[in-house]
């Protein structure tokens, strides 16, 4: 009968032996068997389950001429880079004939330095803000204690008395490293070391000083930033596209933001060059040698509105009779806010000054009193928003109609002097 | 204030045990720290033996492997060192200590001299 | 395991003097040696720990530095006490190893 067919004699004449190495070491399990006729494959199991994906090698050597003498099997399974998951009883497995045949068992063992699973990782902290740092490192062999570095610097007396896997450090005031080391019966590991930055704490307490149409001072109050000081504040602002947007604490606004920096203290600035009578969303963050804080959320707020910086154009006046026809048209310079109408004002050389609200209309008929034998009339128009008036044009004379003619036009020149304005209530 | 002391017999017989007595107080060798054996030798050199964790794990110098013990009774606060088949070159002062953490050893027991002679 | 070698073995200095004691290893041991001081009559004393580390309650004329394999124990303005048997020791892996110690002594 072929060797190794009975069930009491095992073709094994060399069994696995036993590695035990650090992480990362290269290593190879050996066995062998004499057999038969057709040498078979050999499989290898590792706690008993067969290793599919197994990096080994097979020789086989006759050991006569005639196929049916005895073979030497050779196996060998290399191990690289050692890991945990390697660890365990490993076998190697033969079918013959209708036998199932294993050899004795080979251990291997994971022994050294601990290795981290965690280490703590770089961050930005604002100052005086709790947080929490990772640390993790396993064996074997355990048991592995885990001791916390602040600036080199132990945090703690004893091993099982400081923490273990996390950190909280209630909050810190300056630009600080942390590390932790790993201990076993090996020796001793140190993890990377982490920069934890300290940066300004976010500003509070953003809102509006004042307001014009088209600027707006703004103040805020610093938060902490440790032992550096703040060096500057930026303010960001932000048209608020109808006010949908940004909401508070949404991310950036689509349109590209209005910058401005300030120099602290104040915790003040004008913000000038803005819109009149827009929303605009506001935020600021503060900087030190560190960094930037963090934004603030973004403010809503609004300029008000202005008066129109300049007259109305092509003012026209004519003379029928008792009656006066003017019209005109919308100034051609910012309204600065919604044009809520016009007020016109006519005088004749010896008569007091008549003031109309005209409304939103930009033409209006006056009767004149007496049968028009005023003399030298002439109109003044200006527009009005709810801050107030804009400049009046130029005084306009009143010139007689002729049937058939074109209606003589008067260009608007130059401003008055001292345009009037109405101040708006806040 | 944590104070360790060294107990044992002075003499001991080539081949036999020595095993000698470390007594802590003011602190619980179950709390944290390790616990150590070392002796030094005549001429000063010093050699560190092994330790007991806290936790109760072991961990021994391998050139004494095969022949040291080191066990404790965590009802007494006392651990022990047990080395066995000695020859005159286990002549030594053996001192019991506790390390800092895993850094270095921060108390120190006086020191016991044992002898190995027949 | 990891040889200590310690230089000098004996040196004698006044008080007032600063002086070094010099330890190395036979290989890389990061930052972790230790430095004993070892009275008659007295349980050894550690100074300093992980290279450079002061131990609580040792005056801040011990000092220590290094990395790798070579470190230093530097006393300043030695005092009358500090005169006995200095030690090093790594504890970086185990087995722990020493220096074969060095005997500072007045002159």
């Known amino acids: 009968a072929p060797r190794g067919t009975q069930a009491e004699e095992s073709p094994f004449v060399g069994n696995p032996g036993n590695i035990t190495g650090a992480r990362g070491l290269t290593g190879t399990l050996r066995c062998q068997l004499q057999v038969q006729g057709e040498p078979p494959e050999v499989h290898w199991l590792r706690d008993g389950q067969i290793l599919e994906l197994a990096d080994s090698t097979q020789t086989q050597v006759p050991l006569g001429e005639d196929e049916q003498d005895d073979w030497i099997v050779v196996s060998q399974l290399r191990i690289t880079s050692l890991q945990l998951s390697d660890t365990g009883q490993y076998q190697c497995l033969v079918f013959l004939g209708h036998q199932t045949f294993v050899s004795q068992p080979g251990y291997v063992g994971l022994e050294g330095l601990p290795y981290f699973l965690e280490e703590p990782e770089d961050r930005t902290v604002a100052a005086n803000t709790p947080f929490n740092l990772s640390c993790q490192a396993q064996g074997p062999p355990e048991p592995v204690d885990l001791l916390w570095l602040q600036d080199a610097v132990p945090l703690a007396t004893a091993p099982g008395h400081g923490p273990q896997r996390s950190l909280h450090v209630p909050g810190l005031n300056k630009t600080s490293s942390f590390s932790c080391e790993a201990h076993n019966a090996k020796g001793v590991t140190t993890s990377r070391t982490a920069t934890i930055t300290v940066l300004p704490q976010q500003p509070r307490n953003l809102h509006l000083v004042s307001r014009q149409p088209t600027e707006l001072e703004v103040a805020w109050t610093p938060g902490l930033s440790g032992i550096y000081p703040l060096t500057h504040c930026t303010l960001q602002a932000v048209l608020s596209d109808d006010g949908m947007g940004i909401q508070a604490g949404e991310p950036d606004p689509p349109e590209e933001p209005l910058t401005s920096q300030a120099s602290v203290p104040p915790h003040q600035l004008r913000l000038g060059s803005l819109h009149p009578h827009t929303p605009y969303h506001i935020r600021v963050a503060c900087t030190s040698s560190q960094g930037p804080s963090s934004w603030t959320h973004w403010l809503p707020v609004e300029t008000p509105e202005g008066v129109p910086l300049g007259p109305p154009e092509n003012i026209s006046a004519t003379r029928n009779g008792s009656q006066a026809f003017v019209h005109w048209q919308e100034p051609r310079a910012p309204l600065q806010g919604t044009l809520l109408g016009y007020r016109l004002a006519y005088q004749g050389q010896d008569t007091p000054e008549v003031l109309m609200d005209i409304g939103l209309r930009q033409e209006v008929t006056l009767e004149l009193q007496g049968d028009g034998s005023v003399s030298n009339l002439t109109v003044c128009v200006a527009a009005y928003t709810a801050a107030g008036d804009g400049p009046w044009s130029l005084p306009v004379p009143l010139e007689a109609w002729r049937p058939g003619q074109a209606q003589p036009v008067h260009q608007l020149v130059k401003e008055p002097s001292t345009p009037a304005f109405s101040w708006p209530w806040w | 204030d944590v104070q360790l002391q060294e107990s044992g017999p002075d003499l001991v017989k080539p081949s036999q045990s020595l095993s000698l007595t470390c007594t802590v107080t003011?602190?619980?060798?179950?709390?944290?720290?390790?616990w150590h054996w070392i002796r030094q030798f005549p001429g000063n050199k010093l050699e560190w033996m092994g330790y007991i964790h806290y936790s109760g794990s072991t961990n021994y110098n391998p050139s004494l492997k095969s022949r040291i013990s080191i066990t404790r009774d965590t009802s007494k606060n006392q651990f022990f060192l047990q080395l066995n088949s000695v020859t005159t070159e286990d002549t030594a002062t053996y001192y019991c200590?506790?390390?800092?953490?895993?850094?270095?050893?921060?108390?120190w027991g006086q020191g016991t001299s044992v002898t190995v002679s027949s | 395991d990891v040889q200590i070698t310690q230089s000098p073995s004996y040196l004698a200095a006044s008080p007032g003097e600063t002086i070094t004691i010099n330890c190395r290893a036979s290989?890389?041991?990061?930052?972790?040696l230790a430095w004993y001081q070892e009275k008659p009559g007295k349980t050894n004393k550690l100074l300093i720990y992980?290279?450079?580390t002061l131990q609580s309650g040792i005056p801040s004329r011990f000092s220590g530095s290094g990395s790798g394999t070579d470190f230093t124990l530097t006393i300043s303005s030695l005092e009358p006490e500090d005169f006995a048997m200095y030690y090093c020791?790594?504890?970086?892996?185990?087995?722990?190893?020493f220096g074969g110690g060095t005997k500072l002594e007045i002159k």
């Open positions: 020791q790594q504890h970086n892996e185990y087995p722990w190893t």
């Open positions: 003011g602190y619980s060798i179950t709390s944290a720290y390790s």
């Open positions: 290989k890389s041991i990061s930052k972790y």
């Open positions: 200590a506790r390390s800092l953490w895993f850094y270095a050893m921060d108390y």
């Open positions: 992980s290279g450079s």
